[in-house]
Amino acid sequence: NKILVKQSPMLVAYDNAVNLSCKYSYNLFSREFRASLHKGLDSAVEVCVVYGNYSQQLQVYSKTGFNCDGKLGNESVTFYLQNLYVNQTDIYFCKIEVMYPPPYLDNEKSNGTIIHVKGKHLCPSPLFPGPSKP
């Protein structure tokens, strides 16, 4: 028995930050679980982990240097990624694992979300125009 995951097909990070919501066909309330976000077609980079159980507050961490936070809904986890670089544009996959109560459950691989990181636009403000270009 596998959990199904829904993700947006594509997100654009205009300000080098993005909220990626992972929606599950499973209620995480009073479960011990490990939700993670993975980068790349082969999911080789674990970007962020959200660990939750019934007796502690949510714990969020990245072992790979990403600036991330996480929020829990009954049937979703939202990953908030900040300080993304243009070269981190890639496909990102949500993963969910339920450790307790038994049996262990995880998800069918989702279609993933392409996160397109746009560089910060250093446009001159209309109120304070920058030097004119030739």
């Epitope: 011990e32 072992k63 450790m99 307790y100 262990y104």
Partner: antibody
Framework: QVQLVQSGAEVKKPGASVKVSCKAS????????IHWVRQAPGQGLEWIGC????????NYNEKFKDRATLTVDTSISTAYMELSRLRSDDTAVYFC?????????????WGQGTTVTVSS | DIQMTQSPSSLSASVGDRVTITCHAS??????LNWYQQKPGKAPKLLIY???NLHTGVPSRFSGSGSGTDFTLTISSLQPEDFATYYC?????????FGGGTKVEIK
């Protein structure tokens, strides 16, 4: 209380196999990896590999990949490490330890160790 | 694979001394570094996790610092029960591994 209790000392001949057990108690077995670490006489700690009882996924140190087999029996909360084709330099104390599956970075509880002696 | 290098491999010190042990990772492991104490014939015991966090029940004379590739374990005032071997361990990526150990002996 949380405990990992290992099987007793073993003496084996070169070329034989050994299977060491590690019985967990006092915690949810499927919330933690079980790792195996060995220590040759007078030497440091060497990580062999780990298994997650929830889905029986394993990670191995490349050095042991072809000789070590990690298994679990979740019905009795016990993990096993089998090492085949034993050599004299496999003489060591073998420890089991655990790391949390959700917060996996350190080993907080250890077994008492199992001495394996390989001698002809 | 990541390699962990500990120094010194051994040191002699007296009760009350401040002792510093260092650990170097061959690549960036952020804060995913743990310290263990081991006494002869016993299993290792976790002292510090995630570079600077004291494990439950560990005396406050033990402290850890560092991030990236360079880490330090400090014992502020060495006690008789602290004579042991200390190991660092990286918990950033598999395969996990340990440093070679530092034996703290009585001067």
């Amino acid at each position: 209380q949380v405990q990992l209790v290992q099987s007793g000392a073993e003496v084996k001949k070169p070329g034989a196999s050994v299977k060491v057990s590690c019985k967990a108690s006092g915690y949810t077995f499927t919330s933690y990896y079980i790792h195996w670490v060995r220590q040759a006489p007078g030497q440091g700690l060497e990580w062999i590999g780990c298994i997650y009882p929830g889905n029986v996924n394993t990670n191995y140190n490349e050095k042991f990949k072809d000789r070590a087999t990690l298994t679990v029996d979740t019905s009795i909360s016990t993990a096993y490490m089998e090492l085949s084709r034993l050599r004299s330099d496999d003489t060591a104390v073998y420890f089991c330890t655990r790391s949390h599956y959700g917060l996996d970075w350190n080993f907080d509880v250890w077994g008492q160790g199992t001495t394996v002696t390989v001698s002809s | 694979d990541i390699q962990m290098t500990q120094s010194p491999s051994s040191l002699s010190a007296s009760v009350g001394d401040r002792v510093t042990i260092t650990c170097h990772a061959s690549q960036n492991i952020y804060v995913w570094l743990n310290w263990y104490q081991q006494k002869p014939g016993k299993a290792p015991k976790l002292l510090i996790y995630k570079a600077s966090n004291l494990h439950t029940g560990v005396p406050s004379r033990f402290s850890g610092s560092g991030s990236g590739t360079d880490f330090t374990l400090t014992i502020s005032s060495l006690q008789p029960e602290d004579f042991a071997t200390y190991y660092c361990q990286q918990g950033q990526t598999y395969p996990y591994c340990f440093g070679g150990g530092t034996k703290v002996e009585i001067k």
